[in-house]
Interface confidence: medium
């Protein structure tokens, strides 16, 4: 997180840490973690942790490790021979089904999914919270959770920023309605290592709750504007995937 500040896991209890690759995710119920497809495409058996503000290895040993049962990548995500050259991050969303249910508590609890009503349509200027252990201004990786509050911006703002290390012509980068552009204020942004974490917005119908409006996906340059997977467009796929892959007990 660039331009952010120290955060406590108690304020982001849905935050999941992936250690390979170094990334994030969001707990959405006791059996399921939501993340970005690009986080899990290269590792279908990710090790995840919840409930710890610090990801120093000695601290992780004391936090709750989650074991995956299966990874479900959105069918619209294009799997590439050489993922390093990716210019299309459309449908950057995945679900991880857990082997065992997560025990909830003050440092571990799920984030809501967006509702289907127009109340959950984001407007430019709407504020969301991002969190993660990715690159900061001072560190390649954060040991302690960082967070920032940033506004939704028009997609063109993201298009206007020059890609820092283009793997193709600027025109090759794909921008779709499945993406949210956010940031641009005081250099606050998500960055390498924050991928898959939630862009959390206050629930318009219950101010005590947050919902995952977006997932950290990609960006032209850290510290400018970032692109987030628009979770609202995938609620049907999320619900269907969870229903088809749940045990009778969960239903």
């Amino acid at each position: 997180i660039i331009g952010g500040s120290d955060a406590d896991i108690k304020n982001f209890p849905w935050q999941v840490f992936f250690d390979n690759p170094w990334a994030g995710g969001a707990l959405i119920n006791e059996y399921w973690v939501l993340t970005a497809a690009h986080v899990v495409e290269g590792n279908r058996e990710p090790t995840m942790y919840v409930g710890s503000t610090s990801v120093q290895t000695s601290r992780l040993a004391k936090s709750k490790m989650l074991t995956p049962e299966h990874v479900f990548i959105h069918p619209g995500w294009k799997l590439l021979e050489v993922p390093e050259g990716r210019t299309n991050f459309d449908n950057d969303i995945a679900l991880v089904r857990l082997k065992d249910p997560v025990k909830m508590g003050p440092t571990v609890s799920p984030i809501c999914l967006p509702g289907t009503s127009s109340d959950y349509n984001l407007m430019d200027g709407d504020l969301g919270l991002i969190s993660g252990w990715g690159r900061t201004e001072k560190r390649d990786r954060a040991v302690r959770l960082k967070a920032a509050r940033l506004p939704v911006a028009p997609l063109r703002k993201c298009k206007e920023v020059k890609v820092e290390k283009p793997t193709a012509d600027a025109e090759a980068y794909v921008f779709t309605p499945n993406m949210i552009c956010a940031g641009g204020e005081k250099g606050m942004d998500s960055c390498k290592g924050d991928s898959g974490g939630a862009f959390a917005v206050q629930d318009p119908n219950d101010k005590t709750k947050f919902y995952a409006a977006g997932l950290v996906s990609w960006g032209p340059q850290c510290g400018t504007y970032g692109l987030y997977t628009r979770v609202k467009n995938y609620v049907d796929w999320i619900m269907k995937t969870m229903q088809e892959n749940s045990t009778p007990r969960e239903d």
């Epitope: 990786r141 302690r144 820092e164």
Partner: antibody
């Protein structure tokens, strides 16, 4: 598992340049940071710098700012270190190293490349 | 630059005894409550091997006879009981501030 394979030994003339490579297997270099470390014969370790292969961000130790150039090619999963205007002081073993899942230490190292500068 | 000073320069320790190695940083290497201090072992012809990270955490697979401690500027490494295979050079390294720096690396010999 994670492995870093470095290019073979080099014998070069003073004033010349040399390019060393470090090819990773078992992980994508864009997910990590590649560091380079120098070790002169019978001497200690010196940090040259690091590169983030995802966006080519580099950080050099001041001492190596004009001597070394780090690059990375994510398509071949390879990082390179170029050393220019070589002198006998540059005769050393050069290691590449990565964090792995750690946050600021090196669990993984290449086997090292010996560069010998001699007329 | 943060200067790392290790002592002694050389030590010879009998099998089964304790080998204490000290590392002092010219300024604090702590950040956000953690010490960015790591220890490596190097044998001739081999790359360094991580022993201890963040001052006191034993790397996976490293025997428990190795222990590290300290915070701020003083970081001792202890090997006890010393075994034959521990004959090597030991480097401390700080990664709190660029440029990352290593200590001089005392050589441990087993008597």
């Amino acid at each position: 598992q994670v492995q870093l394979q470095q290019s073979g030994a080099e014998l070069v003339r003073p004033g010349a340049s040399v390019k060393l490579s470090c090819t990773a297997s078992g992980f994508n270099i864009k997910d990590d940071y590649i560091h380079w470390v120098k070790q002169r014969p019978e001497q200690g370790l010196e940090w040259i710098g690091r590169i983030d292969p995802a966006d080519d961000h580099t950080k050099y130790a001041p001492k190596f700012q004009d001597k070394a150039t780090m690059t990375a090619d994510t398509s071949s999963n390879t990082a390179c270190l170029q050393l220019n205007s070589l002198t006998s002081e540059d005769t050393a073993v050069y290691y590449c190293a990565i964090y792995g899942s750690g946050w600021a230490w090196f669990p993984y190292w290449g086997q090292g490349t010996l560069v010998s500068v001699s007329a | 630059d943060i200067v790392m000073t290790q002592s002694p320069d050389y030590l010879a320790v009998s099998l089964g005894q304790r080998a204490p190695i000290s590392c002092k940083a010219s300024q604090s290497v702590d950040y956000d409550g953690d010490s960015y201090m790591n220890w490596y072992q190097q044998k001739p012809g081999q790359p360094p091997k991580l022993l201890i990270y963040a001052a006191s955490n034993l790397e996976f697979g490293i025997p428990t006879r190795f222990s590290g401690s300290g915070f701020g500027t003083d970081f001792p490494l202890n090997i006890h009981p010393v075994e034959e295979e521990d004959a090597a050079t030991y480097y401390c390294q700080q990664s709190n501030e660029d440029p990352w720096t290593f200590g001089g690396g005392p050589k441990l010999e087993i008597k």
